[in-house]
Interface confidence: low
């Protein structure tokens, strides 16, 4: 199709080489067409025109994204050619940064239902640059945490070195929806709830004598509880002794509950005590069996192919540890009678 009639938008992504970060492009179809496709309508119901020139479907994923190769080749369907770019409804997610993401991206409706629709498309010229050392050293992270129940703030990484007074007007989106009230480089959250978690996008306009473009940054915000002040609990095994049958295989499970820590390095392992000897056992990998906001339950099993007389004289010890401390629980095997 002819892309000369597409509206054009220029975006700049300055990424940090120090951290992982993502980027998004919204299919910013001209108002009010966008509302038909992406439900990202910025107009209030009173402002919606009576006659829409572009009668699209309401299917949220009903847009097609293309990349325009720089050598003038035909447009390429994003989904077929770029595994690190994912389309989610009307948003294009770039999972990894890099200058190779620079280029022109075009979005348009999949279904062309009227002559007007042919020109209903947006061309986004994306320039991707690594952050220079001269840039602000302490810029806000692209991953930010908010402590549940407290006051918090979300900073726009590309503007976090500027004072509020110097900062240009910022447009914020949360999970693709415009946050029309927020205009500064920092969103202040009076009381943090779990629904404040999500993908935030901050845009501001930068101009020089020749042109203007939108500088965009993406912030992944997660809501967290405070770091635990306690060491892990062993939930299982509960009892100190376990009745077993000689010659039979046996699996003993160790389940431990670890409190939330931002830097989480849980340890869960089995070792065996036999008179004065003590050694760690090579056992299957630990697995997380339940994860909540406050804590995580991790399980690790010790497997004996066959219970022997010698095993009855040993103690099987589960050892769990976090940054606060460790807990152990030992199990003595006892032969089943009768």
């Amino acid at each position: 199709f002819n892309i000369s009639g597409c509206s054009t938008k220029k975006l700049l992504w300055t990424y940090s080489t120090r951290s992982e970060e993502e980027f998004v492009l919204f299919c910013d179809l001209p108002e009010p067409q966008k509302s038909h496709f992406c439900h990202r309508n910025r107009l209030s119901p009173k402002q919606v025109p009576e006659h829409l020139p572009f009668m699209g479907s309401n299917d949220l994923s009903d847009v097609q994204w293309y990349q325009q190769p720089s050598n003038g080749d035909p447009l390429e369907d994003i989904r077929k050619s770029y595994p690190h770019i994912i389309q989610d409804k009307c948003t294009l997610h770039f999972l990894t940064p890099g200058v190779n993401n620079s280029g022109s991206y075009i979005c348009r409706p999949k279904m062309i239902k009227s002559p007007y629709d042919v020109a209903c498309c947006v061309k986004m010229i994306l320039e991707v640059k690594p952050q220079t050392n001269a840039s602000c050293e302490y810029s806000a992270s692209h991953k930010q945490d908010l402590l549940l129940g407290s006051t918090g703030s979300i900073s726009c990484p590309s503007l976090s070195c500027q004072s509020d007074a110097q900062s240009p007007a910022v447009t914020w989106y949360k999970n693709g929806k415009l946050l029309s009230v927020e205009r500064s480089n920092r969103i202040v959250v009076d009381e943090v709830y779990d629904y404040h978690q999500g993908t935030y996008v901050c845009d501001y306009t930068q101009s020089d004598t020749v042109s203007s473009w939108t500088v965009r940054a993406v912030v992944q915000v997660r809501t967290i509880v405070g770091d635990t002040k306690l060491k892990p609990d062993i939930l299982d095994p509960v009892e100190d002794t376990l009745e077993v049958e000689l010659g039979k295989p046996l699996t003993i499970s160790c389940k431990a509950r670890f409190g939330f820590e931002r830097v989480f390095n849980p340890v869960i392992k089995w070792y065996i005590k036999d008179s004065d000897l003590e050694w760690e056992v090579s056992v299957p990998e630990a697995k997380s069996i339940k994860s909540t906001l406050k804590d995580e339950i991790i399980e690790r099993n010790i497997i004996l192919e066959k219970v022997t007389q010698r095993d009855l004289r040993r103690k099987f010890v589960c050892f769990v540890q976090n940054s606060i401390g460790n807990t152990t629980q030992s199990v003595q095997l006892k032969e089943k009678r009768g």
């Epitope: 306690l230 509950r257 670890f258 409190g259």
Partner: antibody
Framework: QEQLVESGGGLVKPGASLTLTCTAS?????????MCWVRQAPGKGLEWIAC????????TYYASWAKGRFTISKTSSTTVTLQMTSLTAADPATYFC?????????????WGPGTLVTVSS | DVVMTQTPASVSEPVGGTVTIKCQAS??????LAWYQQKPGQPPKLLIY???TLASGVPSRFSGSGYGTEFTLTISDLECADAATYYC?????????????FGGGTEVVVK
């Protein structure tokens, strides 16, 4: 035989303080379990107050209503105390000392007979 | 924190009958639930732990079932000695909290 015995209960005036003691016999506080205090007002249900981890980490847990006014401490390998301050008409109850395991295996759940606290002017 | 809701508050059944007491947790507590029997002037006595495991010395007339949020204590072949108040308790200890909470209790009257 493993046993818990509470002591220190009695009659106190409103606003007074009191310390209850739980003494263990037949075992000592050094494992992967908790020592807790639970109370029961006359004719009412059971109400958990606080727990302390039985090893030397001193990890404590309180019911939200008990924070600030009640303090649980491990004073030796066989004694745990509950300090209560600013006692009110809402505090009279039988106070039980309980040994508990995180996952609640039977041999770890052990209750003392209780000690009665009365608050009256 | 977890809230345990016990029903009914009171139940009356003849000797030889069956009593069913329900306990509902406000969130998933897996099988971390205990049942107690308490008689006047005595501390609670453990009947069942891990939702369905009978504590030692407890007659098999007592049985527990359930998982997650819904739990049941059943007493069959009621005897006069079963007249008491029964409590459920969440025995799941979190790491920053101990939701060591009890249900409100069910008084069992044996006629």
């Amino acid at each position: 035989q493993e046993q818990l015995v509470e002591s220190g209960g009695g009659l106190v005036k409103p606003g007074a303080s009191l310390t209850l003691t739980c003494t263990a016999s037949g075992f000592s506080f050094n494992g992967n379990y908790y020592m807790c205090w639970v109370r029961q007002a006359p004719g009412k249900g059971l109400e958990w107050i606080a727990c302390i981890y039985a090893d030397n980490s001193g990890s404590t847990y309180y019911a939200s209503w008990a924070k600030g006014r009640f303090t649980i401490s491990k004073t030796s390998s066989t004694t745990v105390t509950l300090q209560m301050t600013s006692l009110t008409a809402a505090d009279p109850a039988t106070y039980f000392c309980v040994r508990h395991k995180p996952a609640g295996g039977s041999s770890y759940i052990l209750w003392g007979p209780g000690t009665l606290v009365t608050v009256s002017s | 924190d977890v809230v345990m809701t016990q029903t009914p508050a009171s139940v009356s059944e003849p000797v030889g009958g069956t009593v069913t007491i329900k306990c509902q947790a406000s969130e998933d507590i897996e099988s971390y639930l205990a049942w107690y029997q308490q008689k006047p002037g005595q501390p609670p006595k453990l009947l069942i732990y891990s939702a369905s495991t009978l504590a030692s010395g407890v007659p098999s007339r007592f049985s527990g079932s359930g998982y997650g949020t819904e739990f049941t204590l059943t007493i069959s072949d009621l005897e006069c000695a079963d007249a008491a108040t029964y409590y459920c308790q969440c025995t799941l200890y979190g790491v920053n909290f101990v939701p060591n909470v009890f249900g409100g209790g069910t008084e069992v009257v044996v006629k």
